[in-house]
């Protein structure tokens, strides 16, 4: 007997069974069912993505596909061999034994086998195409990765080189800084020591200078006295000689007038025969109180008592009422003689005031007032001036009529502001007025457009701060 049966085994694969008498032939064929469904990320017959999501994933998938391809190839080869080796004998027997209707079954099986083989071949072709496509993509990606890697390696090398350079430079600079710090510390130490030494030296020199100043004053006075004594002796000798040579002369005793040892101003000192410019001791009128002043014995016939002098900014002129009253500074340099002394002196006799000025361009000018006096403290040392002549302006830069004196702590001006605070220094401020010789001292090239400088408007204009000033007085009848 003979029959043909189609069934499904326990693994789900289809099998073809041919029963021919006592012989049974079973053919197990690979099915499309055994291929993965298209919902799988590894679709057997679907179009591939443009690029894999991940390089490692792509490699894994490629290996899977290669395994499938290899398995299929082996299976086909086995099938081929089986057909060639075994089926030849069987077919001969079948041809001899089976009846005509079994030929159709065999043809169907052959056709089915051919169809299956063709389908499998198509799938394999698809897989091969996909594999090739994927391999090409992977190769391209690998190439790109390789190029990127090379670039990155080059960049890293460059950066490493740059970092090394910077590290070297940094080390060099650190070393340099350390060296400099060392040197700096040494220099600082050395400078500190030098500073200490200089301070000691300065203090020593200061005391020496003070001593010398005292000695100079004493020497000047002694010299003046000697000059006067010599002068008196000469006069006495001359008068004695005259008396001796005169035939009718009766013997007489030369009575020396009492020697003057106190002076109220520099004019008296000059008239006493002391004609050298320098520091002298003056005595307040009707008092034993003394004050040191600089006497100018050279300008315009000499005999000038200097009441103010500016030359280098070494003395601060932003002082209190008391300081301006009593005087401050050094008669050898910058100073203010004192309002109280000047007030007392000019209140007893008629004095002239001369103001000498120097600018930063080497020019000099002066203003001369033929009558000057200061009122007493009860009138805030108000200034009185008349009769202006000179080269420092035809109009008086000290406001007329005279103003009261103002200082930073005593505001007596005519301004809604406080001129002494705004302009600096004590002065006969108006509101605030065309002058201030006690203003802030400014050096050359910083002396223009100044609101608080040393000002004398009618000579140099506004905002010009002068280089040097001197105010001096002398009796009008000198």
């Amino acid at each position: 007997y003979s029959n043909f049966r189609k069934s499904v085994d326990s693994t789900g694969r289809r099998q073809y069974q041919v029963q021919n008498g006592p012989c049974s032939y079973t053919f197990l064929l690979p099915e499309t069912d055994s291929c993965r469904s298209s919902s799988s990320p590894y679709m057997s017959n679907a179009v591939q993505r443009d690029a894999p999501l991940d390089y490692d994933d792509s490699v894994q998938r490629l290996q899977v596909l290669e395994n499938i391809l290899e398995n299929n190839t082996q299976w086909l080869m086995k099938l081929e061999n089986y057909i060639q080796d075994n089926m030849k004998k069987e077919m001969v027997e079948i041809q001899q034994n089976v009846v005509q209707n079994q030929t159709a079954v065999m043809i169907e099986i052959g056709t089915s086998l051919l169809n299956q083989t063709a389908a499998q071949t198509r799938k394999l072709t698809d897989v091969e195409a996909q594999v090739l496509n994927q391999t090409t993509r992977l190769e391209l990606q690998l190439l790109q990765h390789s190029i990127s890697t090379n670039k990155l390696e080059k960049q890293i090398l460059d950066q490493t080189s740059e970092i090394n350079k910077l590290q070297n430079k940094n080390s060099f600079l650190e070393q340099k800084v350390l060296d400099m710090e060392g040197k700096h510390s040494e220099q600082l130490q050395s400078m500190k020591e030098q500073k200490d030494e200089l301070q000691v030296l300065v203090s020593k020199q200061s005391s020496v200078i003070d001593e010398l100043e005292k000695k100079l004053v004493t020497a000047t006075v002694n010299n003046s006295l000697l000059q006067k004594q010599q002068h008196d002796l000469m006069e006495t000798v001359n008068s004695l000689l005259t008396m001796m040579s005169s035939p009718n002369s009766k013997s007489s005793v030369a009575i020396r007038k009492e020697e003057q040892t106190t002076f109220r101003d520099c004019a008296e000192i000059f008239k006493s025969g002391l004609t050298t410019s320098g520091i002298y001791t003056l005595t307040f009128p009707n008092s034993t109180e003394e004050i040191k002043a600089y006497c100018d014995m050279d300008v315009g016939g000499g005999g000038w008592t200097v009441i103010q002098h500016r030359e280098d900014g070494s003395v601060d002129f932003q002082r209190t009422w008391k300081e301006y009253k009593e005087g401050f500074g050094s008669p050898l340099g910058e100073y203010w003689l004192g309002n109280e002394f000047v007030s007392q002196l000019t209140g007893q006799h008629r004095y002239v005031l001369k103001i000498q000025l120097k600018d930063w361009e080497g020019n000099e000018a002066h203003s001369l007032y033929d009558h000057f006096y200061l009122a007493g403290e009860e009138s805030n040392y108000r200034i009185h001036l008349t009769g202006l002549t000179g080269t420092a302006g035809k109009i008086s830069s000290i406001s007329q009529p005279g103003s009261d004196f103002s200082t930073k702590d005593s505001d007596n001006d005519k301004c809604i502001c406080k001129c002494s605070q705004m302009l600096s220094g004590g002065w006969w401020f108006d509101a605030c007025g065309p002058s201030n010789l006690n203003g802030q001292y400014y050096p050359q090239k910083q002396n223009t457009n100044k609101f608080n400088g040393i000002k004398w408007y009618y000579w140099k204009g506004s905002g010009y701060s002068l280089k040097a000033t001197t105010m001096m007085i002398r009796p009008a009848d000198f």
């Epitope: 301004c415 809604i416 502001c417 509101a431 605030c432 506004s462 905002g463």
Partner: nanobody, 129 residues
Framework: EVQLVESGGGLVQPGGSLRLSCAAS????????IGWFRQAPGKEREGVSS????????YYADSVKGRFTISSDNSKNTVYLQMNSLRPEDTAVYYC??????????????????????WGQGTLVTVSS
């Protein structure tokens, strides 16, 4: 350092207009009064106009009243002088100058020229046909 820089001068026909500017640095216009002055060849420098208190107070010389207008822009620290109906006698070098606003005599509104301590270099205005 106080600096004042004038600009805007030039040649203009009689009846024409010009606007001068005075840019200040080193001071703030809140605390200072600014004045415009002019000096014709061979003549004394004279006051033209002044401004203070952010424009709250202005002053004009009789010769320019009704023709000149002074104004200020404190944000730019600049003062302007608008000059209209210019005459040949307005020909001069125009200067701007500054004075601390508080430096005023009791009962007075304006400042004598000698109170202005900061000055610009000047700008020439020529009125000619």
């Amino acid at each position: 350092e106080v600096q004042l820089v004038e600009s805007g001068g030039g040649l203009v026909q009689p009846g024409g207009s010009l606007r001068l500017s005075c840019a200040a640095s080193g001071i703030t216009l809140d605390d200072y009064a600014i004045g415009w002055f002019r000096q014709a060849p061979g003549k004394e420098r004279e006051g033209v106009s002044s401004i203070r208190d952010n424009g709250g107070s202005t002053y004009y010389a009789d010769s320019v009243k009704g023709r000149f207008t002074i104004s200020s822009d404190n944000s730019k620290n600049t003062v302007y002088l608008q000059m209209n109906s210019l005459r040949p006698e307005d020909t001069a070098v125009y200067y701007c100058a500054a004075v601390p606003a508080g430096r005023l005599r009791y009962g007075e509104q304006w400042y004598p020229i000698y109170e202005y301590d900061a000055w610009g270099q000047g700008t020439l205005v020529t009125v000619s046909s």
